[in-house]
Interface confidence: medium
């Protein structure tokens, strides 16, 4: 039988009455256009909703927008358009919400063609009040907050000026002209690229990378011949043009650009690209595109310096620059990532790693599923996950995979079971152990969200017809109840719940359509009365993450340590609550060769954990560029995996002897860098 229809599925008592008392409808007095929704702060209950409607006239487009505010998680909304003087807000800039709980909001207004500059509306009290500010420039990008200080904003102008405000947008100063891209770094540092000969596009590959650490009082050129740059974790990356040809290489800095090292990655040509798939303070996943229009490349994982890279996954699906990749960080379990590969026969298959890219495998076939038509062997196949690529291909996939850090082990995704991703209508699958095992959770495509740190999962069927039913589960998707939230079905457009999955409120967004008008409508359902009591100690059970053989002493060891979690029992119907903190207990493991990656000049043969010297380098002194010097590297071939905490066990030792010769590579050594002050 389908999940949720088994006899043993316990029913939540009187749930219809409980939910009916906690269902709040709000009809927006708006013609249907577009709607965008932003949460302001964490656990504040404040939501801003911006509706926009365009009326195309013969010579121009007339726009109208309305702003609504809720302070009870979407149960009630108040029209606050008058606070922004009924101004039309530009949706392409969205609502710029300040970091953390700053309560800051910036809205960018549409202004008439002849005006000297743009206009913004600023709030620093969670959108209770707004201040109108006229800008001395026309913004090209959304205002960007400094992660360290929400009073510091930066923006690029349509004339490529870099503008900075130190008082939350009240006063603006142009600190540099001819700027292509600007990003906040740590400690209120700004990194940006500049062009010299006309435009960003014309100078691509000849840009300069600059840094200011004092909001534009002084500058330092930290790179030349720059194609692009990026920040990931504690790493600053720049792709730099080679001296002799049109290829470029990645260079990396861990000291804000003072010193650079050439990453041991393949160079790429004009039509290829690099992409930082994921980065943290320990390491980075880097995608390097294959030559030609193949649609795939190779994933490499870095060492702790971002310099030495190990090949992690071949034929990684990634369509063109800025295109689609299915690479997904499973945030509910450490070390787990899911992505797709393009196989030789051009079919797409899902791969998963549990050890931060060390090894990739297919997803285990769900026990309650049959292999589909793509499977050669009906008894042997895998689960394949639909993600960004499937969505871009307009398959019937309404949502990407979902996981939440505080809903430990839970992953929800659309998928098909076979030898490759199928174009057939997908079903929804759930894993409760971070991707090791999977179960079919719902038949057909659905929207889904996690509430109360995993205590409740909510789903709505993806349908072209109007809907009025929501499904929910209190046991991690094993059993489902259905609730009719309105008599009059609506055209569903989206589910909204507070980011972080701690809330017990869900908002269902859609529109009603009648002969004369269509209107936006939201239904907010509070599940607090379904989970009647607070969870107690007895409601939780110990769960060893990454466990495959509970007796084995090394069971659960990933990156040198194992973690035991307190997990809510599936049978417990209770509230984790907004203050729920994941209880985890790490313990150190013995080091094995799996805890080390191969150092520069070494590689791991297939199905072998030992690192062996690359044949072409055997017997040669290994020389590579590090911090702008040439180093002589004496190594036994191993380097500890970034973030690995193992102790004892095997301990391959490594030493680096410094020859202090200048590098011949073309990146900047500190001596070549220059500074200037405003």
């Amino acid at each position: 039988s389908a999940p949720g229809e088994d006899e043993e599925c316990g029913r939540v008592r009187d749930f219809v009455a409980k939910l009916a008392n906690n269902t709040h409808q709000h009809v927006f007095d708006d013609l249907r256009g577009s709607v965008s929704l932003s949460w302001v702060g964490d656990s504040t209950g404040v939501i801003l909703v911006l509706t926009t409607f365009h009326v195309p006239l013969v010579i121009m487009t007339f726009g109208q927008s309305k702003l609504y505010r809720s302070e009870d998680y979407g149960k009630n909304f108040k029209d606050i358009t008058d606070l922004i003087n009924n101004t039309f807000i530009r949706t392409e800039f969205g609502m710029a919400i300040g970091p953390e709980n700053s309560g800051k909001v910036v809205l960018t207004a549409e202004v008439s063609g002849g005006s000297r500059g743009g206009r913004i509306f600023r709030s620093s009290d969670f959108a209770k009040n707004f201040v109108q500010t006229d800008l001395p420039f026309h913004p090209l990008t959304q205002m960007m907050y400094s992660p360290q200080n929400s009073d510091y904003l930066l923006a690029l102008s349509t004339e490529n000026g870099l503008w900075v405000s130190k008082n939350f947008g009240g006063k603006w100063e142009e600190i540099h002209k001819a700027v292509c891209l600007a990003k906040w770094g740590s400690d209120n540092t700004i990194f940006f690229t500049t062009y010299a000969n006309g435009s960003c596009k014309a100078d691509l590959g000849a840009l300069e990378l600059w840094r200011t650490s004092d909001l534009g009082k002084s500058f330092k050129t930290i790179g030349v011949k720059i194609y692009s740059f990026g920040l990931g974790g504690r790493f600053l990356f720049a792709s730099v043009m080679a001296d002799k040809d049109t290829t470029r290489r990645i260079h990396v800095s861990t000291d804000q650009g003072d010193t650079w090292s050439m990453a041991q990655l393949p160079s790429v040509g004009q039509e290829q690209f690099y992409s930082i798939l994921a980065a943290n303070d320990d390491m980075v996943f880097m995608h390097v595109d294959e030559p030609g229009d193949t649609g795939f490349g190779t994933i490499f994982t870095s060492d702790d310096r971002g310099i030495v890279y190990s090949k992690s996954l071949d034929r990684h699906l990634y369509t063109t620059t800025g295109g689609e990749t299915d690479f997904t960080n499973v945030t509910s379990l450490r070390g787990v990532y899911i992505t797709s590969v393009l196989s030789e026969d051009n079919s797409i298959q899902t791969m998963i790693t549990f050890d931060q890219g060390g090894r990739w495998t297919h997803l285990r076939k769900p026990e309650n599923s049959e292999c589909d038509a793509t499977a050669k062997n009906k008894n042997e196949c895998s689960l394949h996950i639909h993600a960004s690529y499937s969505i871009s291909q307009k398959l019937n996939v309404p949502m990407a995979p979902l996981s939440e850090p505080n809903a430990v082990g839970i992953v929800i995704a659309h998928g098909s079971v076979g030898d490759a991703i199928s174009v057939m209508v997908p079903d929804v699958y759930i894993s409760d152990d971070g991707g090791y095992s999977w179960t079919k959770m719902l038949e057909g495509p659905h929207y889904y969200t996690i509430l109360d740190s995993g205590g409740i999962i909510v789903a709505i069927e993806h349908s072209s017809r109007p809907i009025n039913v929501i499904k929910f589960s209190t046991d991690e998707g094993q059993c489902w109840q259905t609730y009719t939230f309105t008599r009059d079905p609506i055209y569903f457009t989206g589910l909204a719940s507070e980011p972080g999955a701690r809330s017990m409120n869900i908002s269902i967004w859609g529109f009603t359509e009648s002969f004369l008008t269509s209107q936006w409508v939201s239904y907010t359902i509070d599940f607090k009365d379904i989970l009647e009591r607070n969870c107690e100690e007895k409601d939780y059970t110990i769960w060893l993450a990454h466990s495959t053989d509970p007796e084995d002493y090394e069971d659960g060891c990933i990156l040198g340590y194992k973690e035991q979690f307190l997990r809510l029992r599936k049978s417990s119907v209770c509230q984790n609550g907004r203050d729920y903190v994941v209880t985890k207990q790490p313990s150190i493991c013995l080091c094995s060769l799996e805890d080390f990656l191969c150092d520069f000049g070494y590689y791991r043969p297939e199905n072998d954990s030992k690192c062996v010297e690359q044949p072409e380098l055997k017997g040669h002194d290994l020389e590579f560029c590090l911090y702008g010097r040439e180093e002589h590297l004496t190594t036994n071939g191993y380097r500890k995996i970034p973030g690995d905490k193992c102790q004892g066990g095997v301990n391959p030792v490594r030493e680096v002897k410094d020859l202090k010769k200048k590098c011949t590579s073309n990146f900047l050594s500190p001596e070549k860098q220059n500074s200037k002050s405003n």
Partner: antibody
Framework: EVQLVESGGGLVQPGGSLRLSCAAS????????MSWVRQTPDKRLEWVAI????????YYSDTVKGRFTISRDNSKNSLYLQMNSLRAEDTAVYYC???????????WGQGTLVTVSS | DIQMTQSPSSVSASVGDRVTITCHAS??????IGWLQQKPGKAFKGLIY???NLKDGVPSRFSGSGSGADFTLTISSLQPEDFATYFC?????????FGQGTKVEKR
Amino acid sequence: EVQLVESGGGLVQPGGSLRLSCAASGFTFSTYGMSWVRQTPDKRLEWVAIISSGGSYTYYSDTVKGRFTISRDNSKNSLYLQMNSLRAEDTAVYYCSRSSSHWYFDVWGQGTLVTVSS
Amino acid sequence: DIQMTQSPSSVSASVGDRVTITCHASQGISSNIGWLQQKPGKAFKGLIYHGTNLKDGVPSRFSGSGSGADFTLTISSLQPEDFATYFCVQYAQFPYTFGQGTKVEKR
């Protein structure tokens, strides 16, 4: 019944060697990490060494590193501790103990006494 | 190395008494602590693991509490067979270390 039985203890002179054995029964020996722990005459417990379930990985306390070697033979369900360059302060009752991924030191043997004296 | 400081070193008690033994770790060890019982001439016996979890077959009068650096073993109502020496052990990181032991003797 889960059981661990140590043997091989005795009197040895400083600088001498001894090999302790631990015979395991009643459980799947090859899936458990195994430790040696000693109890000194003043009844303090000191963890000595551990070996992973497959036998590939070991770890030692600083006091015995370089002198003691822990090993196992999964085909014989046996754990060993080769003790070289013995010192007076190594005098203790030596216990073997098993550890799973969830449980540390959950099963112990009766111990074997090692006395290092001239 | 992580030091485990156990107190008291001995306690005199009668049958039916509530006995509490504490262990302090020199740094945070999450809940990676176990409690062991030693009786003369008998093998050590594991009582509690992960700070609070009772090993199968161990009477419910034994309980563990604490997390981080401070931990407690409690015997709610002392029974004749509970007179023994109790040790805590941390297994958060190598080298594993033990408390000095607490001897529970008859008053």
